[in-house]
């Protein structure tokens, strides 16, 4: 008795697909050993057709796959485009040879069934409408017309021209004639259900002179499309139910014990388990729609069905499309934090993984909104302007080659709480969902900027200081100037942090930025932040207003300002005499109606270097640490 288990008999028809699941005992060896599918020959030899080692025979090329699901202790063999030649005896098994543990499977592929010449075959999907055509001779033009369904030897009337309708076909069957046609009548049966399948006889007239036609109705249950997705990746269910239900409410449901539980519908219903990670998008006016689910979990695996009905709920006799979703736990997508916590006034740095093979792809960050079908408007992207309401407090830092980019949001409010998606224009599987939870702050922020009312005067020297706690002692401190295409790091002159970390003085840890001389274009948002390598940490923002010098206002000598910087031993002075052509992205409104020019983070740092180090403490050249 084999410990491997599977279907002993599999039967299908030509052109179909099969998906054969083989179950194996849950042991570490079994999970990792070779899985195979072979065909038993008359000589007792079992020829491998496909294996988990990557082998694929010529006859299976382009139509078969073998997928291992170690977490379920199963593997699945999918074979498409079946022909009668596929009929035979097979083994699914485990082991380095085809003589290891196995299970015998018999596959039988039949021809599409044929019927006698006078039988018309109608093949329809569940929920659709069939129109049965019934021909008759002129002699029966005024006779009674009817359609009956064969049940054993009897034929039970479904509908007739005297307006009788069988109760189980009520509101579903109509008998009619088209135009001036004198030799055909038609019967429409709508909202087809599986039990409608069978042999029908339509009849015009009575007795031996009656005209009869046979019709075989096949009602097909939806064959689930098999979807194999990695843990933490995303899946899109593309649903095309046809024009006849274009105006009905649409839904996606997941088959469960009792029913099919609606996950989302166009009437605003949404399963809380999918909050923040689902979008329903109408595709066109013909009723096509798609449902995207991100951040796939192990428990998302199962049978899904999309459909349409005015109630937004599954209804027998309405068209459906089906899928079986498998979620593979051996995922290439790294595990990232699903919940990020922040406090009001503070900041968060969110790391977004993307496919490292697609470092040049465009990166985006969007805010998932719960309204009706869910939507995710882009807030920032490598070629998307920062959305209104996020100016000065949101930036995206790409880190080419690292397989991740960072999104920083500061000046947090409780309204920022919610779900956000990281996405790229490349591999659509790499969409990650983050829930941001913003709580009321209970203490002062870690980074504080002085002065808090920052107004600089053109032509003068202006210094802002950023106070940081000792816990950031060893981290790199930076100032950057925020613009619509990121926050460009400003040059830093390392003048402080000379004392040992043991004797760190909490009150005197400062990193300063000096604008010398102030220009009109220096106006804007500036960020003070900390980072370690490519890992960004806390940030704080300040808006620097720039105004003309008014008569009588004191003129500060630049050297005096820098002398003050020199007097503070723990201070890190940053200085910027940034020229307009270096600090502004070249935007041509004709070229970029809704986009912007972009350099990567490395280029930004280079481009925004201050021109020289005039007036820097001790005349040293600056170095970023």
């Amino acid at each position: 008795q084999s410990p491997i288990f599977g279907p002993q008999d599999v039967s299908s028809i030509e052109g179909n697909s099969v998906s054969i699941t083989c179950y194996y005992p849950d042991t570490s060896v079994n999970r990792h050993t070779r899985k195979y599918w072979c065909r038993q020959g008359a000589n007792g030899y079992c020829a491998t057709l496909i294996s988990s080692n990557g082998y694929l025979s010529k006859e299976y090329s382009g139509r078969a796959s073998l997928i291992n699901f170690p977490e379920n202790s199963t593997f699945v063999i999918n074979i498409a485009h079946l022909t009668q030649e596929d009929t035979g005896s097979y083994k699914c098994g485990l082991g380095t040879t085809n003589r290891g543990l196995f299970f015998d499977v018999s596959l039988e592929v039949s021809q599409v069934p044929e019927f006698p010449n006078d039988t018309h075959v109608y093949t329809k999907d569940i929920g659709r409408t069939v129109t049965i055509e019934c021909r008759f001779k002129e002699g029966n033009a005024h006779s009674k017309k009817s359609l009956c369904k064969k049940r054993g030897e009897a034929c039970e009337v479904v509908i007739d021209s005297t307006e009788y309708v069988d109760p189980s076909y009520k509101d579903r069957a109509i008998l009619f004639m088209k135009g001036t046609s004198r030799d055909i009548f038609y019967v429409n049966i709508s909202h087809l259900i599986p039990s409608d399948a069978g042999l029908y006889v339509c009849q015009a007239g009575e007795g031996p002179s009656a005209d009869k036609n046979n019709a075989d109705l096949q009602v097909l249950e939806p064959e689930p499309e098999l979807l194999y997705k990695d843990l933490r990746s995303s899946v899109t269910f593309e649903c095309d139910l046809g024009r006849e239900v274009a105006n009905d409410a649409k839904y996606l449901c997941r088959k469960n014990k009792e029913t099919c539980d609606v996950i989302i519908n166009t009437l605003g219903k949404r399963d809380p388990a999918f909050e923040g990670r689902i979008l329903l998008t109408p595709r066109d006016d013909n009723g096509r729609f798609s449902v995207l689910i991100t951040g796939l979990r192990k428990e998302d695996a199962g049978h899904y069905q999309c459909g349409a009905h005015s109630s937004g709920l599954p209804q027998e006799g309405w068209p459906v499309q089906a899928w079986q979703l498998f979620v593979n736990e051996e995922s290439t997508i790294p595990n990232s934090r699903s919940v990020v916590k922040g406090v009001t006034g503070g900041s968060v740095a969110i790391v977004c993984p993307y496919n490292p093979k697609e470092s040049s792809s465009l990166k985006y960050w969007c805010h998932w909104e719960a309204d009706e079908n869910g939507r995710c408007p882009v807030l920032v992207g490598t070629q998307a302007l920062v959305q209104e309401g996020y100016e000065g407090r949101l930036a995206l830092f790409d880190q080419p080659g690292s397989g991740a980019y960072t999104v920083i949001l500061n000046q947090l409010t409780t309204q920022d709480s919610g779900f956000y998606w990281c996405l790229t224009d490349g591999d659509s599987r790499w969409r990650t969902t983050i829930e941001l939870q913003v709580a009321e702050a209970t203490k002062k922020p870690d980074l504080e900027v002085t002065p808090q009312n920052a107004t600089a005067v053109i032509g003068e020297t202006f210094t802002i200081s950023c106070h940081y706690p000792c816990k950031f002692y060893s981290q790199e401190k930076y100032w950057c100037k925020w613009s619509n295409d990121g926050c460009h790091i400003l040059p830093s002159h390392d003048e402080g942090a000379r004392q040992s970390s043991v004797s760190c003085d909490q009150s005197s840890q400062i990193v300063s930025m000096t604008l010398n001389p102030v220009k009109k274009e220096d106006e804007g948002w500036y960020w003070c932040g900390v980072k370690e390598g490519q890992v960004y940490g806390e940030t704080t923002a300040i808006y620097v207003a720039v105004e003309e010098r008014t008569r009588g206002s004191p003129h500060i000598n630049p050297t005096d300002a820098n002398a003050r910087a020199k007097d503070a031993p723990e201070e890190e002075a940053m200085e910027s005499s940034v020229r307009e052509d270096e600090n502004k992205a070249n935007l041509d409104p004709r070229l970029f109606a809704d986009e912007r020019e972009i350099q990567n983070a490395g280029d930004q740092a280079q481009e925004n270097r201050a021109s020289g180090n005039a007036g820097s403490a001790g005349g040293q050249s600056g170095s970023s640490k």
Epitope: P7, S195, E223, H303
Partner: nanobody, 126 residues
Framework: QVQLVESGGGLVQAGDSLRLSCAAS????????MGWFRQAPGKEREFVTT??????????YYADSVKGRFTISRDNAKNTVYLQMNSLKPDDTAVYYC?????????????????WGQGTQVTVSS
């Protein structure tokens, strides 16, 4: 809800045959697989056979103890599943339960099934 009604049980001699039927009614369009389990007095409910389907493709699973003797089939139009039992043995004596599932991860596991019939007694005398 799906209702299941079994019929066809009875008393037979060893070596004889018997055909059980299980008629499903209600929301049958949600079902994905139907099968048979049996329970002998003082024993656990055990898997006998299951048929699952996907469109016009059928998958039949059997317990080792009934392989080659029992055959499961279904009539889609009648929403009925049949169990043809040949070469019956006294060991086959049990109450036979019909079960239906909407989602089936492992057909051998009773908890995977959502709906159950009341059961029909099969007694095989020697």
């Amino acid at each position: 809800q799906v209702q299941l009604v079994e019929s066809g049980g009875g008393l037979v001699q060893a070596g004889d045959s018997l055909r059980l039927s299980c008629a499903a009614s209600g929301r049958t369009f949600t079902t994905y697989g139907m099968g048979w389990f049996r329970q002998a007095p003082g024993k656990e409910r055990e898997f006998v056979t299951t048929i699952t389907w996907s469109g016009s493709t059928n998958y039949k699973y059997y317990a080792d103890s009934v392989k080659g003797r029992f055959t499961i089939s279904r009539d889609n139009a009648k929403n009925t599943v049949y169990l043809q039992m040949n070469s019956l043995k006294p060991d086959d004596t049990a109450v036979y339960y019909c079960a239906a599932s909407t989602v089936l991860r492992d057909p051998r596991v009773p908890t995977e099934y959502d709906y159950w019939g009341q059961g029909t007694q099969v007694t095989v005398s020697s």
